[in-house]
């Protein structure tokens, strides 16, 4: 597993460095999670041919994965810091059930899958501290999540492989869009 944020060689080599700001900590946390996703994607792509699947085939999958849209205030046109922050936190909370699904999907990267899940929880906490309008953040319903998880786990092998690939790809894209927006704040 990658070294957790704040423990990399750069920090060790620069003891005079100021403590990380809230923005720097969030930035590092996202980059750390992206590292983990990269490792998980490697295993997924080595195991199946899902990574070569066409976008059309992937689009047929009816997963309701969070995605950034212009209305969310995270794009440069119509950028709105608070609206965007709410979208990022809400999206990450919605991804949690899918990250739970990933937990039993990896053999050699089991630890990595757990690290991605736990690091995402920490990221949500960091972001919630940054947000002013916590009331606007809707938390997914646990009952709905539980039935979704059961449904996903009941799929056949091919669909489970496809779901795993789609979750990783979409989560990576969502984090990249979030990283870009957060750096503009």
């Amino acid at each position: 597993a990658p070294v957790p944020p704040g423990e990399d060689s750069k920090d060790v080599a620069a003891p005079h460095r100021q403590p990380l700001t809230s923005s720097e900590r969030i930035d590092k946390q996202i980059r750390y999670i992206l590292d983990g996703i990269s490792a998980l994607r490697k295993e997924t792509c080595n195991k199946s041919n899902m990574c070569e699947s066409s976008k059309e085939a992937l689009a047929e999958n009816n997963l309701n994965l969070p995605k950034m849209a212009e209305k969310d205030g995270c794009f440069q046109s119509g950028f709105n810091e608070e609206t965007c922050l709410v979208k990022i936190i809400t999206g990450l909370l919605e991804f949690e059930v899918y990250l739970e699904y990933l937990q039993n999907r990896f053999e050699s990267s089991e630890e990595q899958a757990r690290a991605v899940q736990m690091s995402t929880k920490v990221l949500i906490q960091f972001l919630q501290k940054k947000a002013k309008n916590l009331d606007a953040i809707t938390t997914p319903d646990p009952t709905t999540n539980a039935s979704l998880l059961t449904k996903l786990q009941a799929q056949n092998q091919w669909l489970q492989d496809m779901t795993t690939h789609l979750i990783l790809r979409s989560f990576k894209e969502f984090l990249q869009s979030s990283l870009r927006a957060l750096r503009q704040m």
Partner: antibody
């Protein structure tokens, strides 16, 4: 192999609109983390960033030129188009398109086109 | 906007020498800084991304370091092909900004 190539007029008259096309191969502008930007360089001067478009169609412009610039992409044709209105002799420069593509969005231009020299003169 | 300032604006050195050039950002950009090399009549070429990571294919005699507002590019054992202009780039947030460049002459 990743390649980019700029095309467009070499000479434009003041007040006219410049349209430049960046045709690329070896990557897809629908892959997350991928973007294409435009950078210009007046003769003997430094590089100046103009515009950038991401895989998800998020667009960024240089604040000083924003009112004159439009960037668009055609993913199926592997092309990015930059238009710049109301051209002036001070806009004479070599115009480059360049790719940025990495998981962590380091905004680093790892591959550049050869550049096209645009002269603004009546 | 984040301003990028490079120093010196020009320098000359002999083949085999080592040189260091610097780049300052007007505010903290963490490690979001890139270095490019441009030979006359050619397009720029990425040397270093994220302050200290060498781009694939770039010789190990190049070394980038720094964080927050102060960054350096060091070239050890200069070669004739190292001549040209070096630009640093703010890669933290848009608008992206470049430094004015450091012109390196190899004697």
């Amino acid at each position: 192999q990743v390649t980019l190539k700029e095309s467009g007029p070499t000479l434009v008259k003041p007040t006219q609109t410049l349209t430049l096309t960046c045709s690329f191969s070896g990557f897809s502008l629908s892959t997350s983390g991928v973007g294409v930007g435009w950078v210009r360089q007046p003769p003997g001067k430094a590089l100046e960033w103009l515009a950038f478009i991401w895989w998800d169609d998020d667009k960024y412009y240089s604040p000083s030129l924003e009112s004159r610039l439009t960037i668009t992409k055609d993913t199926s044709k592997n092309q990015v188009v930059l238009t710049m209105t109301n051209m002036d002799p001070v806009d004479t420069a070599t115009y480059y398109c360049a790719r940025s593509a990495d998981d962590y969005l380091y905004y680093s231009f790892d591959t550049w086109g050869q550049g096209t020299l645009v002269t603004v003169s009546s | 906007d984040i301003q990028m300032t490079q120093s010196p604006s020009s320098l000359s050195a002999f083949v085999g020498d080592g040189v260091t050039m610097t780049c300052w950002a007007s505010q903290s950009i963490n490690d979001y800084l890139n270095w490019y090399h441009q030979r006359p009549g050619e397009a720029p070429e990425l040397l270093v991304f994220a302050a200290s990571n060498l781009q694939i294919g770039v010789p190990s005699r190049f070394r980038g370091s720094g964080s927050e507002t102060y960054f350096t590019l060091t070239i050890n054992s200069l070669q004739p092909e190292d001549s040209g202009t070096y630009f640093c780039q703010n890669a933290h947030s848009f608008p992206l900004t470049f430094g004015g460049g450091t012109k390196l002459e190899i004697k």
